[in-house]
């Protein structure tokens, strides 16, 4: 029978038929930076080319006995998970291995850097199709390793890395903390985070998604026909590298941003038991388990969005947190969240020619997060319209006044320390969906976008009695671009998007009382692109899966900003 | 990468004309920073990645590395250039005493220096 991990990444509609994906990934080359490998193993023979690159530290111990089977174990297994004949994800992918880890699985940042440089030079000398680089390793946070990954990603290479096996925040490790890298945590057959003793998979905002990483059967370096089960975030990353190879083979022109959005979009949602994660990390950790797309094309019509959390601002009164999108993504909305509820809102502002989302801490607050909603919107022209605090008691409001511009998100920011909970909730007048409404002492920021065929609508869910969480979701075919709360009063901890659902969190019910002051409304802005849908339909007639991405060609900007991580 | 662990005496003589003070001091207000792994057991002191500013050319990287060697030699320190980076990041990998970090951070074109550290199979 099909191993549990391969079944898990197979689209649900095919599981009944024991669906086996085709020998995908044939147009893609996957570079593996790991231990030495047993290239004549039957699983990977002829699929993996061992490069002459080797940069490893001495094994500890002057008389260390180099045993080939131990030395090759990690790398051989991962090569098998990516492209193995029987137990591989992308059975058609070709691989190249670089040795950066010694027989004890240990390497150096400098050796890894030289390896990444080797890949870049190889790419320049002999340009091939899409490249995926698998980094199944982790060290402490390294500015230089992250910078090298950023540069390689900027050169069009897709980097996939292990989140780390330290049961810790992945942002404390590299290359896991590099924003441009696709960082993968590990889950087991029950879709639970992988545990081993006091350790286990890393988590947090620097993880993009999870994938199978416990008891994964793959090639064993014991012998050329041996298999063995191994566990770890390396195995999880290898699954995602394989899925990425399949996706890139079907659509070779996909950019890193497009690939990441698709990986997120096709993942299984909300299946991980978040109780395993530390409480403060649950909201930051993506509840996503990687899966292959249901087919090689047909995703192009979708408006893809993801949620990007900033680093924590820290507790000082004027502290701010900034969340950024990738260069070829549009920031369509900005929200903020504070566990203490003490915050001064958020605003979208220009930085280096690109919009960023900045959240503001308040006096006595323990700090805030900025949450950006980052979307793939070709040929988009977005701007922010701001209204200063209003004099009238009706509250502040701002709308998209330019012809053809639609509202994609609302933010509010206030200078006063406490907006108070004594003002009645502000209700949006009917027939004016294209405007943002907020507290009269807050400045309001509307994100207004023009893009071919873009249409958006506002969806609200209000609860008169106080409740810790209010949610509102977009319907099938619509994508959540904006998420905010009405009113922006002090008992609201903040708002954030989880997949296609807008979540508004409020203070513990017991502290707010049950008066009408506790009323909270979650406001979702749901959008879709008729232009993308139309382009997709036109493509359905052709047999080729490539060309889908021609739609996305309009906006390819180099990722030159070194920014906080993503979901 | 050729071995730079050559005759230091010769290197010092060749660069004798350079004063101990830096000929090309870093631009005013930009201070290079030093980084090291927060996890102490993973640190590898004695090996450093010197990262140069983004637009630095390979020839400037090599010149900066030679300058570091010359200035270190004058102070009685041996250094070994292990690799000169170009293609992804400009800079070089150097084996040297941590005592030389202050000197290295003042070299022209230096953006930051990071102490090497371990990475592990996951």
């Amino acid at each position: 029978s099909i191993p549990w991990n391969l079944e898990r990444i197979t689209p649900p509609r095919y599981r009944a038929d024991e669906y086996q994906p085709p020998d995908g990934g044939s147009l893609v080359e996957v570079y593996l930076l790991d231990t030495s490998i047993q290239s004549d193993h039957r699983e990977i023979e002829g699929r993996v080319m061992v490069t002459d690159f080797e940069n490893v530290p001495e094994e500890d111990g002057t008389r260390f006995h180099r045993q080939a089977s131990k030395c090759d174990s990690h790398g051989t297994h991962l090569a098998g998970v990516v492209s193995g004949r029987d137990a591989g994800v992308a059975k058609g992918a070709s691989m190249r291995s670089l040795r950066v880890l010694n027989c004890q699985g240990k390497g150096t940042v400098s050796g890894t850097l030289i390896g990444l440089e080797f890949i870049r030079k190889s790419q320049l000398v002999q340009p091939v199709g899409p490249l995926v680089v698998l980094l199944p390793l982790a060290g402490g946070y390294s500015r230089v390793l992250n910078a090298a990954c950023q540069r390689l990603a900027r050169a069009g290479v897709v980097l996939v890395t292990a989140a780390g096996n330290f049961r810790d925040d992945a942002c404390l490790y590299s290359p896991a903390s590099a924003p441009e890298v696709i960082t993968v945590g590990a889950t087991n057959a029950q879709d639970q985070p992988v545990t081993l003793g006091t350790l286990g998979t890393n988590f947090g905002r620097c993880v993009d998604l999870f994938a199978p990483g416990e008891d994964i059967i793959g090639a064993s370096s014991d012998c050329s026909t041996c298999f063995v089960s191994q566990s770890g975030t390396s195995q999880a990353a290898a699954h995602v590298a394989g899925i990425a190879a399949m996706m890139l083979s079907a659509e070779p022109e996909l950019t890193l941003a497009e690939l990441r959005q698709r990986l997120i979009h096709f993942s299984a949602k909300d299946v991980i038991n978040e109780a395993w994660f530390p409480e403060d990390q649950r909201v930051l950790t993506p509840n996503l388990v990687a899966a292959l797309p249901p087919s090689t094309h047909g995703a192009g019509w979708q408006l893809f969005c993801r949620t990007v959390w900033s680093a924590h601002s820290g507790p000082t009164r004027m502290a701010t947190a900034v969340a950024r999108c990738a260069p070829d993504e549009e920031l369509l909305s900005c929200s903020s969240f504070s566990r203490s509820g003490k915050r001064r809102g958020e605003r979208m502002e220009a930085q280096g020619g690109k919009l960023v989302c900045r959240a503001h801490n308040a006096f006595g607050g323990e700090g805030v997060y900025a949450i950006a909603r980052c979307c793939l919107l070709p040929q988009a022209n977005c701007s922010v319209h701001t209204a200063p605090p209003a004099e009238a008691s009706m509250g502040t409001r701002v709308h998209c006044h330019q012809q053809g511009h639609v509202l994609t998100g609302c933010s509010s920011h206030w200078e006063v320390e406490d907006l108070g909970t004594h003002k009645p909730p502000v209700l949006r007048p009917r027939g004016q969906p294209n405007q943002c409404v907020g507290h009269r002492e807050a400045s309001i920021h509307a994100s207004c976008c023009h893009a071919p065929g873009l249409e958006c609508k506002v969806k609200e869910h209000g609860i008169p009695a106080p409740q810790e969480q209010v949610t509102v979701a977009c319907e099938e075919g619509w994508t959540l671009t904006g998420c905010s709360a009405l009113p922006g009063t002090s008992h609201v901890l903040g708002a954030y998007a989880v997949d296609n659902t807008c979540v508004v969190r409020s203070r513990d019910v017991s502290t707010t009382g049950s008066t009408s002051e506790g009323a909270v409304t979650a406001v979702a802005i749901c959008c879709r692109s008729r232009h993308l849908a139309q382009a997709s339909q036109e493509l359905q007639g052709s047999t080729s899966g490539s060309g889908l991405n021609d739609i996305f060609e309009a906006q390819k900007i180099e990722w030159h900003e070194h920014h906080h991580h993503h979901h | 990468q050729e071995d730079e662990d050559g005759d230091y005496e010769e290197l010092v003589l060749a660069l004798r004309s350079e004063e101990d003070g830096l000929a090309e001091a870093p631009e005013h207000g930009t201070t290079a920073t030093f980084h090291r792994c927060a996890k102490d057991p993973w640190r590898l002191p004695g090996t450093y990645v010197v990262v140069l500013k983004e637009e630095t050319h390979l020839s400037q990287s090599e010149r900066t590395a030679r300058r570091l060697q010359a200035q270190a030699a004058r102070r009685g320190y041996l250094t070994k250039i292990l690799h000169v980076f170009h293609g992804l990041l400009p800079g070089f990998l150097v084996k040297m005493s941590g005592d030389l970090l202050e000197l290295a951070l003042k070299l022209p074109h230096v953006d930051y220096i990071e102490e090497d550290s371990s990475v592990f199979a996951q």
């Epitope: 002057t62 008389r63 045993q67 081993l196 064993s220 014991d222 012998c223 041996c226 063995v228 089960s229 | -």
Partner: antibody
Framework: QVQLVQSGAEVKKPGASVKVSCKAS????????IHWVRQAPGQGLEWMGY????????KFNQKFKDRVTMTRDTSISTAYMELSRLRSDDTAVYYC??????????????WGQGTTVTVSS | DIVMTQSPSSLSASVGDRVTITCKAS??????VDWYQQKPGKSPKLLIY???NRYTGVPSRFSGSGSGTDFTLTISSLQPEDFATYFC?????????FGGGTKVEIK
Amino acid sequence: QVQLVQSGAEVKKPGASVKVSCKASGYTFTGYTIHWVRQAPGQGLEWMGYINPSSTYTKFNQKFKDRVTMTRDTSISTAYMELSRLRSDDTAVYYCARERIYSNYWFFDVWGQGTTVTVSS
Amino acid sequence: DIVMTQSPSSLSASVGDRVTITCKASQNVYTAVDWYQQKPGKSPKLLIYSASNRYTGVPSRFSGSGSGTDFTLTISSLQPEDFATYFCQQYSSYPYTFGGGTKVEIK
């Protein structure tokens, strides 16, 4: 649950052979190497070797190389260890153990209950 | 073969005592050392893997440390169920080798 169940105690004469079985359940048998470790009365543990059940690959401690045979039957998820030309100092409890690989860590996470082999004339 | 020398070979302690067992490798084995507990008539049970990582379900009073050639197993506060024999084992190179064992007895 995951377990290894070994065959019962054996009494053998010097020069004879003994074959101990180890039946695995609760996991994919071919996914883990099965190691054999013995313990003489009142003594420490001694590693004998292992078999990778996904093939027939074996690795032995040189001390036992000429006398030990390790086999497996995947249809019944069972590993076997046969020790020939028995001597009195082979009297011991023989354990099978499953080796697990996590990250770059290796350890025996599941052990059989042990099989006592007594060699006596 | 790598020799693992365990000390002491036996010790007597009381409930609540802090107990330290050491293991010395004849050559550097990095952190490729596991610790096992064995009770009379029972199979060994994994406590610590890779020198310092506590295995699933093992109480927090057990901790391991060391790298290279010197390794330590510490029981911070001895409990009645901890009276047993403890073994270290290296997996840095074949053949795998075990220490001679440390028997922890009730004083």
